[in-house]
């Protein structure tokens, strides 16, 4: 049979090298030789290339090399397959030098901060050493910071009497590390060199670019002083380099600001204790280049009523992520704080804690939590400067087994019943949130049978049992992830009761 | 031959934020190509917003400073804009437009949808 | 950012004029840039790129010339569908910024 004819012809003029065009070859059953037809200086000369390789891949590929090719030039390509049973032809292709020109990379051989000019990098390279003189050159810089994954982009053209070959990029983050990478193409061309070298390079440090500031109310002591204990974090979006000296902190009941105090620390944390009004309190971070904005949070009066709107809260599991939801009843309301926490027994030292804005859910990657805790998680709403009354959940990142069962015992043993109790697993053992309990009980050498009660019951009555017959029970505890049974406690039901 | 069409809600309150998605049909949005947003005031005035490429890089204009966010759907064939804190000074016609990688102009536009900004 | 100023704001004209609209851009732009036309209710039409490259299927009457930071549309003979609004763009460097139009009516 024929050979297939040849399709999807593409040509590439690797600038100053040579010209490569590919093509899809078809199915071929017997051995194919392709022969390349081109005509050159415009319409003026015409010359051919044959595959001389053997195997398939690179039989759909030929190429031309210099000093047969200039530019600007314009060429017609024709695919030529020929086997012992003849020739077939492709259709005729039409190529302009320019616009399938395709340069090697430019090379960056510096990326540095300028002195005095915030937030910018200064990226400077080599242009291309084969490159069209003639032709202004277009340019695509991607620049990344180094904890990213995502590129961000940014296009220009340098023209052909730019002798400067550099480019500001403004509008980036202080303090933070960049990966740049640039590539180039002929003004006229389709085709883009390939990526430069990735190239390293830093913005300035500034002032603390601001804080988040939040507060953790205590009861009021017996002097009537209130613990309140103040927490503070970088700004979302602060460079992840960011370097504090210190922090000033200012703060004075609502009613006299000539009351005010003020202390510096070095910590993220501080315990103030206030009177029953309500307070300000005003924060700054600073470094050596200046201060940071500043923060301030309201305190409310001892008495002071908080407004209540979230309706329903809840929590599940999706693709890796905690997520909570709210419903809120008040429509003003778009800021909301998130608070969360382990639930153990002690008092808690680690409270974490974010502020969500224009939503009412908020999402926290399942790694960023330890798996088979409890945590409590609060949601506060946040109107101006009031804080609303928050709603909690309790919430696993990932539920497991019970690593034990419930303590189980046996009481009000009759003729034909029982009462199975058991205990609450402790918070540390449970892994999940226990879904439900199932009672299993089976008499000597007979028919095991179960029943399932949900998490809030902890003791059930067998009925319908056998009189003076030995009986085997366990209980189990089941979160989402699987049941773990206690241990098995033996019985045996009388054989006659008092009222016989 | 590619064509495109934009949807969303067509008011959107002060504060809140403003999501518009843009359908792609008779083209992959992963084979080449950056995939624009533009928009166009009350007064005639065009304004460039940003991309997301072919590969998924994105591009912005930086008079939105960091308001503007490009995202994509490839199991949909479609891209999104994500405009937050939206005052009046937003509402427009919003465009969206592919252009060829090493051409900076745009053959092929949407019909747009107009957003209006309001309480 | 590089601006780009359209003259005039406003164009009256009769059919079979030949017509000039200018454009101007703050920075040597060499031949980085591109003509729309928008009619009322419709989306911008591409022209013109590359400051005098034709695009197929626009009417031969529209032609563009100059090159760094002075630009000229001109219409060869207008017909009264070319009203519209007429935009140029910076295709040279980013941010792409579009010029504020110049309006063609027919007198």
């Known amino acids: 049979a024929l050979p297939a004819k040849p399709e999807n012809i593409s040509c590439v003029y690797y600038y100053r090298k040579n010209l490569t065009c590919t093509w899809s070859p078809g199915k071929e059953t017997s051995y194919t030789q392709y022969t390349v037809k081109r005509t050159y200086a415009f319409g003026e000369k015409h010359d051919n290339c044959t595959t001389n390789s053997s195997t398939s891949e690179n039989r759909a590929s030929c190429s031309f090399f210099l000093p047969r090719i200039t530019i600007p030039d314009n060429y017609t390509i024709e695919v030529e397959a020929e086997n012992g049973d003849g020739v077939i032809k492709s259709h005729m292709t039409y190529w302009r030098l320019e616009n399938i020109a395709k340069t090697e990379p430019p090379k960056i051989f510096r990326v540095k901060p300028v002195l005095g000019i915030k937030r910018m990098i200064q990226i400077e390279w080599i242009k291309p050493e084969l490159a069209p003189v003639s032709s202004d050159l277009k340019y695509t810089l991607r620049f990344r910071t180094v904890n990213s994954t995502s590129w961000m982009e940014v296009n220009f053209a340098k023209n052909r009497k730019d002798k400067n070959q550099t480019y500001n990029l403004t509008g980036l983050q202080p303090f933070t590390e960049y990966v740049i990478a640039l590539r180039c193409a002929v003004k006229e061309s389709k085709f883009w060199s390939d990526w430069s070298q990735e190239k390293m390079g830093m913005t300035e440090e500034e002032a603390p670019c601001g804080l988040e500031l939040w507060r953790v109310l205590k009861p009021a002591e017996a002097d009537g002083r209130r613990p309140v204990r103040l927490l503070w974090k970088k700004a979302r979006g602060a460079p992840v380099l960011e370097k504090t000296l210190g922090y000033n902190i200012w703060y004075y009941p609502e009613s006299n600001t000539n009351l005010t105090e003020t202390m510096n620390t070095t910590n993220q944390q501080l315990e103030l204790h206030l009177g029953g009004e309500s307070f300000w309190v005003s924060m700054i971070s600073y470094n050596s280049l200046g201060k940071s904005p500043v923060a301030t949070l309201r305190i409310p009066a001892i008495q002071e009523k908080s407004f209540q709107c979230i309706e329903v809260m809840q929590a599940c599991v999706a693709e890796d992520q905690l997520v909570v939801k709210w419903q809120s009843s008040a429509l003003d309301v778009n800021t909301w704080m998130i608070e969360w926490f382990p639930d153990v027994d002690s008092e808690p030292t680690t409270l974490s804690w974010e502020s969500v804005s224009q939503a009412t859910n908020w999402t926290i990657q399942q790694d960023k939590l330890k798996p088979f805790w409890c945590y409590n998680i609060s949601v506060y709403p946040m109107l101006h400067d009031k804080v609303g009354e928050p709603y909690s959940i309790q919430a696993y990142a990932k539920e497991g087994v019970p690593s034990e069962g419930p303590e189980t015992k046996v009481e009000n043993i009759g003729v034909k019943t029982v009462t199975i109790t058991w205990k609450e697993i402790p918070k540390s053992e449970r892994k999940g949130i226990i879904c439900n309990y199932t009672i299993f009980y089976q008499a000597e050498g007979g028919k095991g049978f179960s029943k399932t009660v949900n998490s809030s019951i902890l003791q059930y009555g067998l009925e319908s049992l056998k009189r003076k017959t030995s009986y085997i029970v366990q209980v189990m505890a089941s979160t989402s992830a699987g049941g773990t049974n206690g241990t098995s406690i033996n019985f045996k039901t009388l054989s006659f009761s008092v009222f016989e | 031959d590619v064509q495109l069409r934009e949807s969303g809600p067509g008011l959107v309150k002060p504060s809140q934020s403003l999501s518009l998605t843009c359908t792609v049909t008779?083209?992959?949005?992963?084979?080449?190509?950056?995939w624009n947003w533009i928009r166009q005031f009350p007064g005639n005035k065009l304004e460039w917003m940003g991309y997301i490429s072919y590969s998924g890089s994105t591009s912005y204009n930086p008079s939105l400073k960091s308001r503007v966010s490009i995202t994509r759907d490839t199991s949909k064939n479609q891209f999104f804009l994500q405009l937050n804190s939206v005052t009046t000074e937003d509402t427009a016609t919003y465009y969206c437009?592919?252009?060829?990688?090493?051409?900076?102009?745009?053959?092929?536009w949407g019909a747009g949808t107009t957003v209006t900004v309001s309480s | 950012d590089i601006v780009m100023t359209q003259s005039p704001a406003t164009l009256s004209v009769t059919p079979g004029d030949r017509v000039s609209l200018s454009c101007r851009a703050s920075?040597?732009?060499?031949?980085?840039l591109h003509w729309y036309q928008q009619k009322s209710h419709e989306s911008p039409r591409l022209l013109i790129k590359?400051?005098?490259q034709s695009i197929s299927g626009i009417p031969s009457r529209f032609s563009g010339s100059g090159s760094g930071s002075d630009f000229t549309l001109s219409i060869n003979s207008v017909e009264p569908e070319d009203v519209g609004v007429y935009y140029c763009?910076?295709?040279?460097?980013?941010?792409?910024?579009f010029g504020g139009g110049t309006k063609l009516e027919i007198k």
């Open positions: 920075h040597d732009i060499s031949d980085f």
């Open positions: 590359y400051a005098s």
């Open positions: 437009a592919p252009m060829i990688t090493t051409d900076w102009f745009f053959d092929v």
């Open positions: 008779g083209y992959s949005i992963t084979s080449d190509y950056a």
């Open positions: 763009q910076n295709g040279h460097s980013f941010p792409w910024t």
